[in-house]
Interface confidence: low
């Protein structure tokens, strides 16, 4: 059989008649920042070029001994995960090598500048089809570096990095930090988080996914046709940098925020053993494993959203969170989380000219998140309603008044500290599903969005019982764009939404009141693209979709014949 | 020995070519900060990347990169441009001791220096 | 102000190797690249390739690939196209044209007056 | 190889008049990241080095009047000239820079 990780990798199959030659990826050209490679090897042998790049620093110790096969290992192993002929995600991508790596796996932050800036100024030179940049590095955090990656990213080009090899928080390495990066984190055969000696992978809200990076077999520097297994974060990142690949060479014409939405759409949810992590990293660790799409076509008509944790707000009284958007995407939703439940909710407010979410802590609390729902929806047009505290014991209400303009998410936020047992109304009034209900002493804050054919419903799970968890999810076909809790009593911890559910969390049912005081709804919006289905219909009805997994196909066949020795 | 009279020699210019005055001040009230690595490890103290502010052009950069040149030569220390950033950031990169960061911080254009860090394969 | 200036005409036997010069002044030299366009009598331009005069690397049009050379002399800001086994074929003006590193294309907004370039025998 | 086709090869025109040049190239020189077609238009003299007009198939090159304008995408493009000069009888040349470089075959701008 195949090895674990390309299995891991490729979808089930998808129709039987969408047979593609191995040469995924094709159309793209893929930059590779590491150490030295042996670019003879049979796996790479002309899909290389090695650049004339070399900014490295020099080796530690008096004792070291340069050995070429040592100073190629780490590259040409990756280099053969992206493209190799045999063991490679992207058999048909043409790959570039810059060396900024010694020959002991050691780089600076300066090197990877320069090196980062030579790619930008050869793009600039010789615009070429999509670009993608295998990071397959670490240090620590560092404003410049991920300055450069956000500029080149900017620039139209895909970055994809390591988490770290830490078993720590990403969010303190770079480039790994840097939101514009696709920052990948390493599971292993079962599933589980790597673990790399007494350390392992790197986890939480700076990660966007994770992918195969243990026991991975690739081309070794040993010998032109020795084969090796090697693990890390680097490996994972090799395996997105070669479906990135092969997604940006099926539709070129992806974005970064298109590309990254889509890893996270065809990913495999929930499958990680959450335990391994940290218990205050586990609701921030996305819970995906990297796969190919089943097919190249049929993905245009999806309404993609993306859940986006900020950092923590601190525990100061008047702490905020922030959390935004990717400069493409839209902000359709805002709601926050506390360990605590001692939090002042949240809104949605413009900052630089496009919105972002802010969650507020409140006195005595440890500190806030907050969450934004951001979506790729063309063409649209948001705004935020907001209404005062009520007056009346009815609650505050809101709704999307405009003409054509649709509910997607409700947050509320108010400047008492305990906002107290009272308990609007959960049912809404007949006829009026576009408007979001709240406790009389909040503000409510209606996200309206017209976009050609969004349609959008409300969908609610109430519990009468004290839980700690209530959810609500929607169904094939619709996307999560708005998670709130009903009622916005302290006892609630806050709302998230992970995939296509929405979860609202509780305090321990110990330490909550009266069973009517545990009364907790989740309130879940679901939308969905006629126009964008439309537009998916039209061109599958005159493009014959090609799928991408059947690449590995031939493989398949063959493999057994190869590399059974695993080390 | 070369390289460093190579060096000499253009801090020699530069001292003859550049004002040291504050005709080029940073406007009132921005002040420019400075970052190093948390991992005390992986410090490299004795290269620092200044970054420049966004819209600074490539001839700012290296007259901003002489200019800090000028006026260490004139506190008797000697420093060595590696790279002048243009492209993607605005900037350059400068092996110097840390003495100087009050004064490299106090530049025109300057919006933050970072002090050179190691980075691992992973 | 910015200038490309080219080194004198030129005449060659076919058979032989011409070396045209275009010296840059008024910019920094290493942070453009250098073009090579020549345009035969009465004809339109043609591509021949450029050189990236900081790390020396070219990239070379198809039919000038096995005839050309292009260099470049940092220290006095030179770029150099050479180009041999001349044919009468080969008689045009060539120019040097420097490539505008700023922004997103691959445009020569400055360029050299024209090196003239006789083959005959 | 990308091919350029300009049209007319030659055109004949009075002071005043407005002028249009198209230009084909064989495939599109839309660049899918930047939103920006690779496309730059040159207006040479007899005798003289070729001068930058239009860079992304619109864009005026600083100090270029503003009675030159370019348009298009793709694969079509056009330069027009709104109101002749007399100083603008020269030979036009569109160029690709998607793929390497390609000069179209020159359009040449008589008085009449």
């Known amino acids: 059989s195949i090895p674990w990780n390309l299995e891991r990798i490729t979808p089930p199959r998808y129709r039987a008649d969408e047979y593609q030659p191995p040469d995924g990826g094709s159309l793209v050209e893929v930059y590779l920042l590491d150490t030295s490679i042996q670019s003879d090897h049979r796996e790479i042998e002309g899909r290389v070029m090695v650049t004339d790049f070399e900014n490295v620093p020099e080796e530690d110790g008096t004792r070291f001994h340069r050995q070429a096969s040592k100073c190629d290992s780490h590259g040409t192993h990756l280099a053969g995960v992206v493209s190799g002929r045999d063991a490679g995600v992207a058999k048909g991508a043409s790959m570039r090598s810059l060396r900024v790596l010694n020959c002991q796996g050691k780089g600076t932050v300066s090197g990877t500048l320069i090196g980062l800036e030579f790619i930008r100024k050869s793009q600039l030179v010789q615009p070429v089809g999509p670009l993608v940049v295998l990071l397959p590095l670490a240090g620590g955090y560092s404003r410049v570096l991920n300055a450069a990656c956000q500029r080149l990213a900017r620039a139209g080009v895909v970055l994809v990095t390591a988490a770290g090899n830490f078993r720590d928080d990403a969010c303190l390495y770079s480039p790994a930090s840097a939101p514009e990066v696709i920052t990948v984190g390493a599971t292993n055969a079962q599933d589980q988080p790597v673990t790399l000696g007494t350390l392992g992978t790197n986890f939480g809200r700076c990660v966007d996914l994770f992918a195969p990076g243990e026991d991975i077999i690739g081309a070794s520097s040993d010998c032109s046709t020795c084969f090796v297994s090697q693990s890390g974060t680097s490996q994972a990142a090799a395996h997105v940098a070669g479906i990135a690949a092969m997604m940006l060479s099926a539709e070129p014409e992806l974005t970064l925020a298109e590309l990254r939405q889509r890893l996270i759409h065809f990913s495999a949810k929930d499958v990680i053993n959450e335990a391994w992590f940290p218990e205050d990293q586990r609701v921030l660790t996305p819970n995906l494993v990297a796969a190919l799409p089943p097919s190249t076509h049929g993905a245009g008509w999806q309404l993609f959203c993306r859940t986006v944790w900020s950092a923590h707000s601190g525990p100061t009284r008047m702490a905020t969170a922030v959390a935004r958007c990717a400069p493409d995407e839209e902000l359709l939703s805002c709601s926050s989380f506390s360990r605590s439940g001692k939090r002042r909710g949240e809104r949605m407010e413009a900052q630089g000219g496009k919105l972002v979410c802010r969650a507020h802590n409140a006195f005595g609390g440890e500190g806030v998140y907050a969450i934004a729902r951001c979506c790729l929806l063309p063409q649209a047009n948001c705004s935020v309603h907001t209404a005062p505290p009520a007056e009346a014991s009815m609650g505050t209400r809101v709704h999307c008044h405009q003409q054509g303009h649709v509910l997607t998410g409700c947050s509320s936020h108010w400047e008492v500290e305990d906002l107290g047992t009272h308990k609007p109304p959960v049912l809404r009034p007949r006829g009026q599903p576009n408007q979001c209900v709240g406790h009389r002493e909040a503000s409510i804050h209606a996200s309206c969005c017209h976009a050609p054919g969004l349609e959008c419903k409300v969908k609610e799970h109430g519990i009468p019982a004290p839980q700690e968890q209530v959810t609500v999810a929607c169904e094939e076909g619709w996307t999560l764009t708005g998670c709130s809790a009903l009622p916005g009593t302290s006892h609630v911890l806050g709302a998230y939404a992970v995939d296509n559910t929405c979860v609202v969390r509780s305090r321990d049912v110990s330490t909550t009141g009266s069973t009517s005081e545990g009364a907790v709804t989740a309130v879940a919006i679901c939308c969905r693209s006629r126009h964008l289905a439309q537009a998916s219909q039209e061109l599958q009805g005159s493009t014959s979709g090609s799928g991408l997994n059947d690449i590995f196909e031939a493989q398949k066949i063959e493999w057994h014949e190869h590399h059974h020795h695993h080390h | 020995q070369e390289d460093e009279d190579g060096d000499y020699e253009e801090l020699v210019l530069a001292l003859r070519s550049e004002e040291d005055g504050l005709a080029e001040a940073p406007e009132h009230g921005t002040t420019a900060t400075f970052h190093r690595c948390a991992k005390d490890p992986w410090r490299l103290p004795g290269t620092y990347v200044v970054v420049l502010k966004e819209e600074t052009h490539l001839s700012q950069s290296e007259r901003t990169a002489r200019r800090l040149q000028a006026q260490a030569a004139r506190r008797g220390y000697l420093t060595k441009i590696l790279h002048v950033f243009h492209g993607l950031l605005p900037g350059f990169l400068v092996k110097m001791s840390g003495d100087l960061l009050e004064l490299a911080l106090k530049l025109p254009h300057v919006d933050y220096i970072e002090e050179d860090s190691s980075v691992f394969a992973q | 102000q910015v200038q490309l200036v080219q080194s004198g005409a030129e005449v060659k036997k076919p058979g032989a190797s011409v070396k045209v010069s275009c010296k840059a002044s008024?910019?920094?030299?290493?942070?453009?690249?250098m073009h090579w366009v020549r345009q035969a009598p009465g004809q339109g331009l043609e591509w021949m390739g450029y050189?990236?005069?900081?790390?020396?690397?070219?990239k070379y049009h198809q039919n000038f690939k096995d005839r050309v050379t292009m260099t470049a002399d940092k220290s006095i800001s030179t770029a150099y196209m050479e180009l041999s086994r001349l044919t009468s074929d080969d008689t045009a003006v060539y120019y040097c044209?420097?490539?505008?590193?700023?922004?997103?294309?691959?445009?020569?907004?400055?360029w050299g007056q024209g090196t003239t370039v006789t083959v005959s025998s | 190889d990308i091919q350029m086709s300009q049209s007319p090869s030659s055109l004949s025109a009075s002071v005043g008049d407005r002028v249009t040049i198209t230009c084909k190239s064989s495939?599109?020189?839309?660049?899918?990241?930047?939103?920006?077609?690779?496309l730059a238009w040159y207006q040479q003299k007899p005798g003289k080095a070729p001068k930058l007009l239009i860079y992304?198939?619109?864009t005026r090159e600083s100090g270029v009047p503003d009675r030159f304008s370019g348009s298009g995408s793709g694969t079509d493009f056009t330069l027009t000239i709104s109101s002749l000069q007399p100083e603008d009888f020269a030979t036009y040349y569109c160029?690709?820079?998607?793929?390497?470089?390609?000069f179209g075959q020159g359009t040449k701008l008589e008085i009449k």
């Open positions: 044209a420097r490539q505008y590193d700023y922004d997103e294309d691959w445009y020569f907004d400055v």
């Open positions: 008024g910019y920094t030299f290493n942070d453009y690249w």
């Open positions: 050189i990236n005069p900081s790390s020396g690397f070219t």
């Open positions: 495939q599109s020189l839309l660049n899918s990241r930047t939103r920006k077609n690779f």
């Open positions: 992304w198939a619109s």
């Open positions: 160029k690709q820079s998607f793929n390497l470089f390609t």
